[in-house]
Structure formats: structure tokens, C-alpha cells
Amino acid sequence: ARNGDHCPLGPGRCCRLHTVRASLEDLGWADWVLSPREVQVTMCIGACPSQFRAANMHAQIKTSLHRLKPDTVPAPCCVPASYNPMVLIQKTDTGVSLQTYDDLLAKDCHCI
Amino acid sequence: ARNGDHCPLGPGRCCRLHTVRASLEDLGWADWVLSPREVQVTMCIGACPSQFRAANMHAQIKTSLHRLKPDTVPAPCCVPASYNPMVLIQKTDTGVSLQTYDDLLAKDCHCI
């Protein structure tokens, strides 16, 4: 069950999709990717306060146990719930190929 | 791609499965769960250093960008890669029923 979307920490502070611009050099891809030269990387960043976008029962348990044992159990973490595909044009031994990656760009986020 | 399983931080410090014993009271379930009285909660805890158990391309990107922009991009996070099912015997409006939860106990872990 996807729980509350209201962030008690203030606007934009809780787990949500962010876009980070990165060059091929930033990503360590310059030697094998031809295009694009720059990637708008969508990723999940932000805090996961109690029951905010809890992905599932496990996330709810984690919240409860983190409250009781913060030194032992970490708070839930903001991670992708799904991904958008992206195409990279890459160098291969035989030339150039177009490859689709299904797990590269976050589409939306939840806490787990 | 599941990347390296060698933890550079020392044994047991990196992302792995831990078991935390929790009572119904700990979990906030005492008013709706009859059995079990105590749950051995398996969860994913530990650090995610560079490429350790990287779940996918997104995790690899996150590692690269965290190295470049640690204040903006968090390190990958240790989360369940899969779950073990578990049953709870619970109270409902119509009586007692046994319900299977597929997303309650972590089975194994990765970094994302």
C-alpha cells in the first residue's frame, strides 16, 4: 500500500524524483558510450519519515523498528519504484550499437 | 547485474540480511494480529560502498554521482532484492482469518 504523500519535513524535503545532469565523464562512460553526451539522470532523493510513501509492509515494519531501535535499524530509504527506459548508442568490438536500458532512469519513488 | 560481494569495510559491515526480533507491540500490530506473538524480521542493513551488490545500472550511476556530488546525491541504499512470504493470523470485522503477506520478510539484499 502506498502511504501518505504529505511531507512533514516541509516541501521537497521528502523522498521524490530529482534530476541530476551528468556528463559521460561523470558517469565513467566516456570510453564506451557515444551518445548522448550528457544524461539527465532521474533519481530518488529525500527523507523517508514515518509512513511517507511506504512501499510495502516491510517498509512499515522498518519505520516502526527504526523508531524503537534507531542505532540498529535504519530508516526506510528512498529508492525507485519503477524505471523509464533509456537508449544509449555505444561502441562495441564490431562497431556501434543502439542499446536500451530498462533500469537506468528512475520513474517514480517510494520508501523501503 | 549483481556486483561484487566482497565488503571493503570489513566483515559484516556491508549490505546484508539481518534478523531483528520484534513483538506485536513493537510493530504496532497488537490490536489486529493474533499470531505470531513475535516476528523474526529479516531486513537489509549495512553500507553500500562502490559497486557492492549494485542492483542495476541505476545503482552504478548513483555510486558514480555520489562520489562526485556527495552532498547532492546519496550513496546507494541497502534494500530487499526479494522477499519471503509470511502468514499473519489476524482479526477482521467478520472474524479471524489467515492472510499471506508476500512483502514482509526480506529474503536477500542489494544496493540501489
Epitope: - | 499470531s35 506473538r37 502468514v87 499473519l88
Partner: antibody, heavy 119, light 111 residues
């Protein structure tokens, strides 16, 4: 939906070993909290609990029959088996398998298989 | 072993009238975890048993509310507020706190 189906030899001779199989569907034998018990009922008599196997392969037996009983499971086949050695006429009964949760909660039962021990 | 003793063994009841079955355990069936694992089953003629009551007093989903369970320690009771024709069969108490055992059964029949 959840189903359990017992199968057995029907007729045995005294001193033989009874082998029973319970094939389950609609749930997994590795689900935490679930297990399967064998329970028997001689004609016109009450229920007698025999053995239980938990999701984690932990086993429990009726102490009065423990030396003759062996319970096991094959999760890949969704089957739970029971062996009862050195049978006598007193082991003639309908044998049921039942799904259990934690310390009881037998919410689904098979229809039972009749076993007769006779020379 | 824990012995579960039911009474009466035979219970003739008039339709619409209440019925009560007692179950006594030879020792306390409060588990070390605090649970009292006492259950009631009904076996209708020609059928497999069916679970009615879980942990002394918790009616299973779908079980009519004319069935109720009570008790603690070693003494437990199943009550039917108004017996209906479909309630005919043998009622068993069961304990799962120690080595699992059933009571010897109480046969409910219509007068």
C-alpha cells in the same frame, strides 16, 4: 484456492510401513508461519494428532508414536509425506492432512484417505 | 501429554435452543509466549473437520455469531446460542500450546 489431497495404499499387512502423501496447492510450504499436520481418525472414534512439519522443516511428533513416525516434505513437488512403520490393525483409520498456522489453526483439511491394516 | 476431556460426550438439543460443551485440560494450556492455544472444530457427518474458534474466543471469518468460545487456564466452553439443523456433528476441542491433542469429541444431535 487452497487444497490438500491425501493419497495412500488403502490396504496394508501388519508389520509393513505405511507411506502417505499430501499434495497441496494454493499455498507454499515455505511460507513463514505455515505447516502441515497429519491427523487420523479410526472409524467411529475421535481425532488423533500424529505429526507436524513447519515451513522451516522443523518437525513435531506425537510422543506415543514418535518411534514409528517420520514426516518430511518436498517443496518442489508441494508434497508432505508421512511414514508409519510396523503397522498393526490399531492403525486402521482415515488419515487426514491439514494446513496449520503457528500452533494450530487448521483452516484447510484434505478429504482423508482410508487405510486398512489386515492380514 | 496434555489430556483434553470434553463433556458431555452426547448432547441432544432441541432446534432453536442453546447448547454448551465443556473442555477441561489436564494442565494449563497457556503457552510460554502468553497465548492460550485452544481451538474448537466441528466435524459434520461424512465431512472433514472445520475450524470454528481460534485462541479460546476468536470466531473464524464466516462462522455464524451464534457460536462463541470462552474460558481460561484449564476450563473452556463452546456455546451455541440457538442450535440450527446444520450444527449437527461432532465437536472437538484442541490445544496447541504443548504437544498437540484433541478432546474425545461431543456429538450434538437434534432431539
Amino acid at each position: 484456492q487452497v487444497q490438500l489431497q491425501e493419497s495412500g495404499p488403502g490396504l496394508l499387512k501388519p508389520s509393513q510401513t505405511l507411506s502417505l502423501t499430501c499434495t497441496v496447492s494454493g499455498f507454499s510450504l515455505i511460507t513463514s508461519g505455515l505447516g502441515v499436520s497429519w491427523i487420523r481418525q479410526p472409524a467411529g472414534k475421535g481425532l488423533e494428532w500424529l505429526a507436524h512439519i513447519y515451513w522451516d522443516d522443523d518437525k513435531r511428533y506425537n510422543p506415543s508414536l514418535k518411534s514409528r513416525l517420520t514426516i518430511s516434505k518436498d517443496t518442489s513437488k508441494n508434497q508432505v509425506s508421512l511414514k508409519l512403520s510396523s503397522v498393526t490393525a490399531a492403525d486402521t483409520a482415515v488419515y487426514y492432512c491439514a494446513r496449520g498456522g503457528y500452533d494450530g489453526y487448521y483452516d484447510y483439511w484434505g478429504q482423508g484417505t482410508t487405510v486398512t491394516v489386515s492380514s | 501429554d496434555v489430556v483434553m476431556t470434553q463433556s458431555p460426550l452426547s448432547l441432544p438439543v432441541t432446534l432453536g435452543q442453546p447448547a454448551s460443551i465443556s473442555c477441561r485440560s489436564s494442565q494449563s494450556i497457556v503457552h510460554s509466549n502468553g497465548n492460550t492455544n485452544l481451538e474448537w472444530y466441528l466435524q459434520k457427518p461424512g465431512q472433514s473437520p472445520q475450524l470454528l474458534i481460534y485462541k479460546v474466543s476468536n470466531r473464524l471469518s464466516g462462522v455464524p455469531d451464534r457460536f462463541s468460545g470462552s474460558g481460561s487456564g484449564t476450563d473452556f466452553t463452546l456455546k451455541i446460542s440457538r442450535v440450527e439443523a446444520e450444527d449437527v456433528g461432532v465437536y472437538y476441542c484442541f490445544q496447541g500450546s504443548h504437544v498437540r491433542t484433541f478432546g474425545q469429541g461431543t456429538k450434538l444431535e437434534i432431539k
